[in-house]
């Protein structure tokens, strides 16, 4: 009976999310394998988040709006492990917008989700950021490694969206 009511709850939650995400990929989690964590298909999952690589070339503002429509934000990178996971799925000859910007050009970088910008957990390429005119951050492959670079916000790039996993 308990299992039945849990299944009914899950089904109703799935139906609720289905209006936003036509398909979800879920895995069982938790010590009793009773919780399901889901990401929209074909998003990828890492720890408690889902990631989507958009190959549509758009400005930073349009890229953030695009993520927002999907219930996400441009990606906020919190650890080297997270960056390493993300870059496994990126093309080395492309650049991708991050959810990091400096809208006033004061070198006060800010994440879209208001996560505090921690200079000690940043992955700028050597010599970057290098221009107060360039107020948005991308991740690209340079000098044999993935890192961040400041660029003009209105120049279209690919982008990475991030959202919290859906738990049902």
């Amino acid at each position: 009976n308990f299992m039945y009511s849990k299944t009914v709850k899950r089904l109703s939650k799935l139906q609720e999310y289905q209006q936003y995400y036509p398909s979800l990929t879920c895995v069982m989690e938790g010590k009793d394998m009773e919780d399901w964590s889901c990401c929209p298909t074909p998003w990828t999952s890492f720890q408690s988040s889902c990631y989507f690589i958009s190959t549509v070339m758009q400005s930073w503002t349009k890229s953030q709006n695009n993520c927002s429509v999907m219930g996400a934000d441009l990606v906020v990178i919190n650890t080297k492990e997270e960056q390493d996971f993300i870059t496994q799925n990126l093309k080395i000859n492309s650049a991708y917008f991050l959810g990091l910007s400096d809208p006033k050009g004061w070198r006060h970088w800010q994440w879209v989700d208001q996560t505090p910008y921690n200079k000690n957990v940043t992955f700028w390429h050597s010599g970057e950021p290098n221009s107060p005119d360039e107020r948005c951050a991308i991740i690209n492959f340079r000098s044999e490694e993935w890192g961040w670079n400041d660029v003009h916000c209105h120049v279209p790039q690919k982008s990475i969206c991030k959202m919290k996993k859906i738990y049902i």
Partner: antibody, heavy 121, light 111 residues
Framework: EVQLLESGGGLVQPGGSLRLSCAAS????????MSWVRQAPGKGLEWVAT????????YYPDSVKGRFTISRDNSKNTLYLQMNSLRAEDTAVYYC??????????????WGQGTTVTVSS | DIVLTQSPDSLAVSLGERATINCKAS??????????VNWYQQKPGQPPKLLIY???NLESGIPDRFSGSGSGTDFTLTISSLQAEDVAVYYC?????????FGGGTKVEIK
């Protein structure tokens, strides 16, 4: 006072090349992103190229990509536009302009007087 | 590309009267409370001159009879009291996304 002086325009045959220069003074050129904008005779304005202050990032519309190259020499306070494989539709007055960021966008705040490029056989 | 459509193509206004120029974008050029539309004035034989940036901010040194308004996809440049020296072509421009694009221009003349 900001001054931008374009030069290098002239008459060139289709398929030919030309290099435009823009000599800048009255501001710290090396800290400014710069752009070229053109205006065909009796027509409107068309953005042609942009280069960041350090010269390591350049941007072009599809209409000139692969044919035009923007560059700069910060030691000479000069902006350049190398134009190859010129076509009749490249005939225009070419202006250089300073770029000023505005949050996530920008404005072109100072413009030179322009130099005329005519592509004709 | 973002297309900007200006109207009217030309406008004849009496001295001291109001002139209004419209600019419609093919998609929104707003983000986080700012609109990325600029207005330029071009007099015959001269380069363009920046009048308004961010849809409504008056550039330094520009007379306050010029004003800009609008958001999203619809923008307006207003000259509250037309002066003889305002005879020119006026262009809107978007800087939200490359390629930067300009409207086709509106020619303002004295009636």
């Amino acid at each position: 006072e900001v001054q931008l002086l374009e030069s290098g325009g002239g008459l060139v045959q289709p398929g030919g090349s030309l290099r435009l220069s823009c000599a800048a003074s009255g501001f710290t050129f090396s800290t400014y992103t710069m752009s070229w904008v053109r205006q065909a005779p009796g027509k409107g304005l068309e953005w042609v190229a942009t280069i960041n202050s350090g010269g390591d990032n350049t941007y072009y519309p599809d209409s000139v990509k692969g044919r035009f190259t923007i560059s700069r020499d910060n030691s000479k306070n000069t902006l350049y536009l190398q134009m190859n494989s010129l076509r009749a539709e490249d005939t225009a007055v070419y202006y250089c302009a300073t770029y000023r960021p505005y949050y996530y966008g920008s404005v072109l705040d100072y413009w030179g007087q322009g130099t005329t490029v005519t592509v004709s056989s | 590309d973002i297309v900007l459509t200006q109207s009217p193509d030309s406008l004849a206004v009496s001295l001291g009267e109001r002139a209004t120029i419209n600019c419609k974008a093919s998609q929104s050029v707003d983000y986080d409370g700012n609109s990325y539309v600029n207005w330029y004035q071009q007099k015959p034989g001269q380069p363009p001159k920046l009048l308004i940036y961010g849809a409504s901010n008056l550039e330094s040194g520009i007379p306050d009879r010029f004003s800009g308004s609008g958001s999203g996809t619809d923008f307006t440049l207003t000259i509250s009291s037309l002066q003889a020296e305002d005879v020119a072509v006026y262009y809107c421009q978007q800087s939200d996304e490359d390629p930067w694009t300009f409207g086709g221009g509106t020619k303002v003349e004295i009636k």
